[in-house]
Amino acid sequence: SIPWNLERITPPRYRADEYQPPDGGSLVEVYLLDTSIQSDHREIEGRVMVTDFENVPEEDGTRFHRQASKCDSHGTHLAGVVSGRDAGVAKGASMRSLRVLNCQGKGTVSGTLIGLEFIRKSQLVQPVGPLVVLLPLAGGYSRVLNAACQRLARAGVVLVTAAGNFRDDACLYSPASAPEVITVGATNAQDQPVTLGTLGTNFGRCVDLFAPGEDIIGASSDCSTCFVSQSGTSQAAAHVAGIAAMMLSAEPELTLAELRQRLIHFSAKDVINEAWFPEDQRVLTPNLVAALPPSTHGAGWQLFCRTVWSAHSGPTRMATAIARCAPDEELLSCSSFSRSGKRRGERMEAQGGKLVCRAHNAFGGEGVYAIARCCLLPQANCSVHTAPPAEASMGTRVHCHQQGHVLTGCSSHWEVEDLGTHKPPVLRPRGQPNQCVGHREASIHASCCHAPGLECKVKEHGIPAPQGQVTVACEEGWTLTGCSALPGTSHVLGAYAVDNTCVVRSRDVSTTGSTSEEAVTAVAICCRSRHLAQASQELQ
Amino acid sequence: QEDEDGDYEELVLALRSEEDGLAEAPEHGTTATFHRCAKDPWRLPGTYVVVLKEETHLSQSERTARRLQAQAARRGYLTKILHVFHGLLPGFLVKMSGDLLELALKLPHVDYIEEDSSVFAQ
């Protein structure tokens, strides 16, 4: 029967007795930087070309027994997971292996850098189709390794890496922490995060998604027909590398940003038990398990968005946090979150010719996060309109006044330390969908975009008193671009998007008593692109 | 592995004096920084990636590496250039004493220097 991991990533329409999705990634080349491999294993024979690249440190220990089967174990298994005949994800993908890990599974940052450079030079000498680079390794945070990954990604290469097996924040490791790399955590057959003894999968905002990574059947280097089960975030990353190869084979022109957005979009949502993660990491960790798209074409009409969390600002009074979108994504909205509730909001601002989302800490606050909503919006022209604090009783407002521009997000930023001491407006005026409304002491920022066929609408859900969380979701066919809270009092910890749902978190004041003035409303801005939908219909 | 201690005898101990005459300080207003792995057990002191500024050409990378060797030799230190990077990042990989870091950080074109560290199969 089909192994659990292949079943998990396969949409129901392909599920038969066998895993046989269309086009197994035949147009794509996958580079594997790992241990040596057993290239004559039946599972990968003829599919993997062993390059002459080798840069590994000496093995440790005086009694080390170098046995080929042990030296090849990790790499052989991963090659099998990516493209193995029987147990592989992308059975049509061809692979090239570079040896950067020794027989003990240890390598160096410098060896990995030289390996990445080798790939870039190979790409320049002999340009082929789409390239995927699988990095099933991790070390401590490395500025230079992250920089090299960034350069390779900007040269059009898709890099996929293991989040790490340290039961820790993936942002503390490289290349997992490189924003341009697709970083993969590991889940098991029960959709639980993988535990590896005391350790386990890494987590946090630097993880893009999870994939099967426990008891994964694959090629064993013990013999040319042997199979073995292995576990780890390497195995999870190999699944995503295989899925990426399939997607790129079906749509070779996909950019890295488009591929990442599709991987997120087609993932299974909210299936991971978040209780496994440390409490402070749950909100930052994506609850996504990778899956193949239900059809290889026809996703183009979708307006794709993802949520990007910043690093924590730190607790100093003037501390700020910045969340950035990828180069070919548009920042459609910006929000902020603080566990203590002490924050001074957020604003969208230009930095290096691109909009970024900046959140501001407040005096006595433990720090803030900035949360960017990053979307794929071709031919978009977006700008930020700002209204200074109104000081008047009904609050501050700003709208999109340019012809053809629609509101995609609202942000508010204030200088006063505690908005809660200033009476907020009780109700938000209705009937003006292209308008952001906020506290009279706050400056309000509207993200206004013009793009072919773009239409947006505002959805709200309010409750009379804060009860921890208020949510509002966009309906089928619409994509959440903006998420904010009204009225933004000190009870509100912040707002953020989880998939297509806007979540507003607030302190539970049911125990301290509350008034109607402490009502909290979650405001979602939902958009769709008629232009993308029409274009995709014309293709079909 | 070609960076073993035994290879130090190959090292160049002195270079053309004109190399030494070139400016030793980085461009005005920029300070190169040093980075190392936060996890001490994974550090590999003695090997460093010297990363040069983005638009640095291969010839400049090679010249900077030679200059480091010359200046180190004048101070009685052996160094070995293990690899010159180009294609992704400009720079070079050097085996040298940590005592030379201050000197290396002052070389022209240097953006930052990172001590090598271990990575592991996951």
Epitope: H65, Q104, G105, N165, F166, L196, G197 | P41
Partner: antibody, heavy 122, light 111 residues
Framework: EVHLVESGGGVVQPGRSLRLSCAAS????????MHWVRQAPGKGLEWVAL????????YYADSVKGRFTISRDNSKNTLYLQMNSLRAEDTAVYYC???????????????WGQGTTVTVSS | ESVLTQPPSVSAAPGQKVTISCSGS????????VSWYQQLPGTAPKLLIY???KRPSGIPDRFSGSKSGTSATLGITGLQTGDEADYYC???????????FGTGTRVTVLG
């Protein structure tokens, strides 16, 4: 439930041999390094030996080097300690313990057996 | 003779805080991960802290670890009678190619 159960302890004369076993259950045995640690009566912990997950490398304390051999049978989920040329100072409770990390991090030991007593006496 | 030195004993009243030091060298604590183990009377040791300051699941946050240079410290706050035990630090020693334990510290809860 993760379990380690030691066996094979007993009273033995100096110069003789003994083989300890440790049966593992509840985890993927072949993914973890394994240690032997001992504790003499009224004394502290003393590390004895370590074997890698795949058996490819072994490390020993100086006090047992050349006399003790650590080994494992991954198909049987069992760890062994072959003790030859036993001495009175080898008298201790012997614990088997699992290495924290599947690979090469030397993080320490996270799961311990209850121990088996070895008494070396004439 | 152990290469890691700990105080033989520390004591404090319930609810108080105690710290246990572990002194080593650059070949062990200075450049390797430190773990702390608790051994209750008559039982096998139990892992409390690994990677200097990380707690396995199930270990309360009353236990904390830190490292500075070639020394490591275990802190126990809100001391309870159930914390009476021997505590050992441990780390790899790169020069010896061996794992080494500290001399051990007996914690006594007064009263």
């Amino acid at each position: 439930e993760v379990h380690l159960v030691e066996s094979g302890g007993g009273v033995v004369q100096p110069g003789r041999s003994l083989r300890l076993s440790c049966a593992a259950s509840g985890f993927t045995f072949n993914s973890f390094g394994m240690h032997w640690v001992r504790q003499a009566p009224g004394k502290g912990l003393e590390w004895v030996a370590l074997i890698w997950s795949d058996g490819s490398d072994e490390y020993y304390a100086d006090s047992v080097k050349g006399r003790f051999t650590i080994s494992r049978d991954n198909s049987k989920n069992t760890l062994y300690l072959q003790m030859n040329s036993l001495r009175a100072e080898d008298t201790a409770v012997y614990y088997c313990a699992r290495a924290i990390a599947a690979l090469y991090y030397y993080y320490g030991m996270d799961v311990w057996g209850q121990g088996t007593t070895v008494t070396v006496s004439s | 003779e152990s290469v890691l030195t700990q105080p033989p004993s520390v004591s404090a009243a319930p609810g108080q805080k105690v710290t246990i030091s572990c002194s080593g060298s650059s070949s062990n604590i200075g450049n390797n991960f430190v773990s702390w183990y608790q051994q209750l009377p008559g039982t096998a040791p139990k892992l409390l802290i690994y990677d200097y300051n990380k707690r396995p699941s199930g270990i309360p946050d009353r236990f904390s670890g830190s490292k500075s240079g070639t020394s490591a410290t275990l802190g126990i706050t809100g001391l309870q009678t159930g914390d009476e035990a021997d505590y050992y630090c441990g780390t790899w020693d790169s020069s010896l190619s061996a794992y080494v334990f500290g001399t051990g510290t007996r914690v006594t809860v007064l009263g």
